[in-house]
């Protein structure tokens, strides 16, 4: 349904009319200062040029000020994530001002119309910030704009239009359609604040990408590759309700960015770390777990500002729910020789044993073919903190790459019944922890017995020389 202002042009016309003939219309953007953690409390509505509500509602001029900016809405109501974020900010920053930017009338439109309204809303926020800057003790450096979906681009416009530089903008899965590949002044970009950090959780290289794929901040974090989020599959959605729909999956993955941010606020003791990498495939191979030269960072609220970084793509794995933190390990396995392997591609499984806990049996994801007489790198992650690793159990299975290969193997086996068993020779496994940056080499328990057949197990223990402690930790990143 049409709103008093509608698209930007109408608003501009309205604002430029002489005061005497301006029609009596309410602004389509309002600023709700959340004065209580109680989500049902009405809060206080701030009004440009009116100082009384600031005083009445206890606006703290010297404290941090958060502006939460929602996105496009089909329902015309605030979505359920909003009060979770408000509550989490109040919990973490007790003295902070938390302002919800309500632009529902302009967002409850056709998506294209809502996109056209983002500039207007950004302008309204900038005007509010300009007015607040006129007050003593209010600093733009203490302002943190948090925008979800379309709201992330609204935050970008606000940062662009404001007089001065906003301290920080966090983009929570910024909207993709109509923004992908757009000019930097027409979308969220690193120029919009002193620090722009972005979480991408629903990006797709095929079909419609609800979230923007391109990096748009100083640091751009792609949890689980930025696409398929654990706990959001159709099966998971089906499990939590009578019927699961693609819409629910989309909502789950898109909104995951908000929950990751909330997690970073409330589970301060369980920070998730992301690692700089050129692309998702390289990260999946486990070759990007370095913290040297600011190559790793906390995600969400705890992210550290990285100087001289722009469009730095970072990756991590997460759990399916809060707390989202996992423990990343790089595993380097040197496969010395194949024996009677034919066309069979091995799939490795490891079980990690630590001082605190033991992991489940973890498959090593094969991104590329396993190379013989070469070091193969894998990424594994555990949901629990294992402590210091003590030993590793390795098994493998032969997985045929196609039905044709399976037939070839079967035919080969039938024609050579005395064919000796397939074997791999693995003497050591090198492990690096992403979270602690410690490196460790594990040697086969029995150096004389390093061949392993499918379904059999090989045990590895810390090599005699123990830990090879290479401290790669960056001074700007506090690792646990």
């Amino acid at each position: 349904s049409p709103t008093p202002f509608g698209p930007e042009g109408q608003l501009a016309d309205e604002l430029h009319k002489p005061k005497a003939i301006q029609t009596e219309v309410k602004p389509s953007v309002r600023f709700n200062l959340r004065t209580s953690k109680d989500p049902e409390h009405e809060g206080c509505y701030l009004s440009l040029g009116h100082s009384q509500p600031l005083e009445d509602c206890g606006f703290n001029m010297t404290a941090k000020t958060f502006f939460i900016i929602h996105g496009w809405t089909m329902s015309g109501i605030f979505e359920n994530w909003l009060h979770k974020l408000v509550s989490a900010l109040h919990t973490r920053e007790k003295d902070a001002n938390v302002v919800v930017v309500d632009w529902l009338p302009l967002a409850h439109q056709l998506y294209t119309d809502a996109v056209n309204n983002t500039r207007v809303v950004g302008h309204s926020i900038a005007r509010m910030l300009d007015w607040l800057q006129e007050k003593d003790d209010f600093s733009l450096g203490n302002v943190h704009l948090i925008g979800y979906s379309l709201g992330a681009h609204v935050a970008g416009y606000a940062g662009n239009f404001v007089k001065g530089t906003v301290g920080r903008i966090t983009g929570l899965d910024p909207a993709g359609p109509m923004f992908e590949g757009a000019d930097i002044h027409k979308r969220l970009s690193p120029d919009d604040a002193d620090f722009v950090d972005v979480l991408h959780t629903y990006t797709r290289s095929f079909g419609l990408s609800i979230g923007i794929q391109m990096p748009v901040g100083h640091i751009d974090i792609y949890p689980n590759g930025g696409d398929f989020q654990p706990g959001c599959g159709l099966n998971d959605v089906l499990g939590s309700m009578a019927y699961g729909t693609i819409t629910e999956v989309v909502k789950c993955e898109h909104e995951r960015a908000v929950h990751l941010f909330v997690d970073s606020l409330v589970n301060q003791d369980k920070p998730s770390f992301a690692f700089q990498c050129t692309d998702s495939n390289r990260f999946k191979k486990g070759i990007c777990l370095s913290c040297r030269k600011n190559r790793c960072n906390s995600i969400g609220y705890n992210a550290k500002k990285m100087r001289n970084k722009r469009n730095s793509k970072m990756y991590l794995k997460t759990r399916a729910g809060m707390p989202f933190r996992v423990y990343h390990y790089q595993m380097k396995i040197h496969v010395f020789s194949y024996k009677n392997m034919g066309e069979i591609e091995p799939t490795f499984y490891v079980t990690l044993y630590g001082t605190n806990a033991d992991s489940q049996t973890l498959p090593l994801e094969i991104v590329e073919r396993i190379e013989q007489n070469a070091t193969n790198t894998f990424l594994v992650y555990t949901e629990e903190d294992l402590g210091d690793l003590l030993k590793i159990q390795l098994t493998w299975e032969g997985a045929s790459q196609s039905w044709y290969n399976l037939w070839k193997e079967l035919r080969s086996y039938l024609s050579q019944p005395h064919n000796p068993g397939r074997e791999l020779n693995i003497r050591r496994i090198r492990v690096k922890s992403g979270e602690t940056q410690r490196k460790l080499t594990f040697c086969a328990e029995d150096p004389e017995n390093t061949s392993i057949s499918p379904g059999r197990e090989l045990w590895f223990r810390k090599c005699r020389d123990g830990w090879r402690m290479k401290n790669e930790t960056s001074p700007t990143v506090e690792l646990p």
């Epitope: 008093p4 049902e40 109501i77 009060h83 979770k84 409850h108 309700m241």
Partner: antibody
Framework: QIHLVQSGPELKKPGETVKISCKAS????????MNWVKQAPGKGLKWMGW????????TYAGDFKGRFAFSLETSASTAYLQINNLKNEDTATYFC?????????????WGTGTTVTVSS | DIVLTQSPASLAVSLGQRATISCKAS??????????MHWYQQKPGQPPKLLIY???NLASGIPARFSGGGSGTDFTLNIHPVEEEDVATYYC?????????FGGGTKLEIK
Amino acid sequence: QIHLVQSGPELKKPGETVKISCKASGYTFTNYGMNWVKQAPGKGLKWMGWINTYSGVPTYAGDFKGRFAFSLETSASTAYLQINNLKNEDTATYFCARRGYYGRRYFDVWGTGTTVTVSS
Amino acid sequence: DIVLTQSPASLAVSLGQRATISCKASQSVDYDVDSYMHWYQQKPGQPPKLLIYAASNLASGIPARFSGGGSGTDFTLNIHPVEEEDVATYYCQQTIEDPPTFGGGTKLEIK
């Protein structure tokens, strides 16, 4: 003290129009949305929709699109429900109920109710 | 739309005893740690009154003999001990998504 006071009972003929009022007091009218709920005689509660009291944007439930209209007189802190082209099945008690914009959106304050009887 | 099924449709309980009303949702009404399920009491000729919000929180001015529980798709309202003034119809409601829907109601009578 928060109150929602509704207009009195109405007796109408089929095809006529009725307009019910809901006057709010004790809180800032524009800071909470207003729901409308129908209760047919001896039946349960059915949500008709709501109106954003700040922007004036109404939202109608599937069964209440067309003949039903929500409106506001913000200066008088009053919400209205108008039913056009009344039918016999519109005979019911209509309640206004306040809901927050944030949080869990339950209906914490209810109007006194207005009984509409449609009979030829 | 989310369908809420209340049981039993009517219930007769002796004074001082416990009354338990069930409400089953066609899909989960949980969001994170919150349940968007609420309970209302309606006495004859009166508007409904909020009793319990978010599954287990007592609304302002409601006596402690009313309690709510449950999560996901299964919720209960308990009244203990039942008093004469509790004779009414009780409705559950979900607000996890629009349209908000109500259960069919449970009529409580005194035995």
